[in-house]
């Protein structure tokens, strides 16, 4: 049927022409819309790790590029911590002693993993290289 009528070619041409691409750069955007849902099911990469690698951050050395957790909860809280001396305090106003140890208040960010990503490589734990 395709050989005789070229209906797929004609329909595709009509769809593509309906987007009114002004230049060749617009075409990949359409491809992204079509392919992204499928590539997301195959593998997802962690943008934060990519940025850290680009910035030559030491923290990125042992991190995997493959994104594992897609839903996380970040909780910022303040905790009391001991310090060797008052010189190590966050600020003079946030510094005290219990008579034995010196204490200060420190901001801590706690990240809780809630839901894993839905892609093939999420549980593979393969090395990046």
């Amino acid at each position: 049927v395709e050989v005789a009528t070229h209906y797929l070619e004609i329909i595709t041409q009509l769809i593509v022409e309906s987007f009114h691409f002004k230049n060749g750069e617009d075409a990949p955007d359409l491809l992204k819309v079509i392919t992204k849902p499928f590539t997301k099911l195959i593998v997802q990469l962690d943008k934060k790790v990519i940025s850290q690698i680009a910035m030559n951050d030491e923290k990125a050395k042992n991190k995997s590029l493959v994104k594992i957790w897609c839903k996380t909860f970040t909780n910022k809280t303040q905790i009391n911590v001991t310090v060797p001396s008052t010189a190590n305090c966050t600020s003079p106003s946030l510094c005290w002693t219990d008579g034995i140890q010196n204490w200060t208040m420190k901001n801590v960010t706690y990240k809780e993993n809630i839901a894993k990503c839905q892609h093939i490589f999420v549980n593979f734990h393969l090395p990046d290289l």
Epitope: W96, T97, G99
Partner: antibody, heavy 122, light 107 residues
Framework: QVQLQESGPGLVKPSETLSLTCTVS??????????RGWIRQPPGKGLEWIGS???????YYNPSLKSRVTISVDTSKNQFSLKLSSVTAADTAVYYC??????????????WGQGTLVTVSS | EIVLTQSPSSLSASVGDRVTITCRAS??????LNWYQQKPGKAPKLLIY???SLQSGVPSRFSGSGSGTDFTLTISSLQPEDFATYYC?????????FGPGTKVDIK
């Protein structure tokens, strides 16, 4: 309600070792929020801090008594103990166990035992 | 060690009187000062901590003030149950030290 109770012999001979135990009830001695301490008061005189202990076993002593004092903790029995060696008549006093908060502003002794009189005499 | 001195060493007062006891530290201790009340044959009882904070369950007629080296305990209207010995204690550093005490008796 937190309660502290001292126990031990009321009479100790000179040059011997004074041993006292403080039993904590109404709360765990393993609480990270408190230190446990010993304070004494000779008859008709003022109060003197002997030393304190954290449940992990870290100890803090009064330098004037440090060479003779050992404070220990037994978390399984919810108790902490005081040992004072080579006692003399000057060590005759009412011995109190108490607690003071860790991590809060200053060391205030908010709960005390009723005290036990220890007399050093032959 | 930090030495604390109290004045007066004793005072006689009547029920309803306003009583003031002072405590002086040998060096600055910021607000790390506590006040205790002791009655004969009993353990000391915490009244005021951190110079001016009233311990839970303590009557509001007791108040504390001061910072650095000079501190004051005030009983606004002396009650019969307030006749006792009062001690200050520094909690700035070890060894923790107590003042010699102030005995408040009936005039």
């Amino acid at each position: 309600q937190v309660q502290l109770q001292e126990s031990g012999p009321g009479l100790v001979k000179p040059s011997e070792t004074l041993s006292l135990t403080c039993t904590v009830s109404g709360g765990s001695i393993s609480s990270s929020s408190y230190y446990r301490g010993w304070i004494r008061q000779p008859p008709g005189k003022g109060l003197e801090w002997i030393g304190s202990i954290y449940y992990s076993g870290s100890t803090y002593y009064n330098p004037s008594l440090k060479s003779r004092v050992t404070i220990s903790v037994d978390t399984s029995k919810n108790q902490f103990s005081l040992k004072l060696s080579s006692v003399t008549a000057a060590d005759t006093a009412v011995y109190y166990c108490a607690r003071h908060p860790r991590g809060s502003y200053g060391a205030n002794f908010d709960y005390w035992g009723q005290g036990t009189l220890v007399t050093v005499s032959s | 060690e930090i030495v604390l001195t109290q004045s007066p060493s004793s005072l006689s007062a009547s029920v309803g009187d306003r009583v003031t006891i002072t405590c002086r530290a040998s060096q600055s201790i910021s607000s790390y000062l506590n006040w205790y009340q002791q009655k004969p044959g009993k353990a000391p009882k915490l009244l005021i901590y951190a110079a001016s904070s009233l311990q839970s369950g303590v009557p509001s007629r007791f108040s504390g003030s001061g910072s650095g080296t000079d501190f004051t305990l005030t009983i606004s209207s002396l009650q019969p149950e307030d006749f006792a010995t009062y001690y200050c204690q520094q909690s700035y550093s070890t060894p923790f030290t107590f003042g010699p005490g102030t005995k408040v008796d009936i005039k």
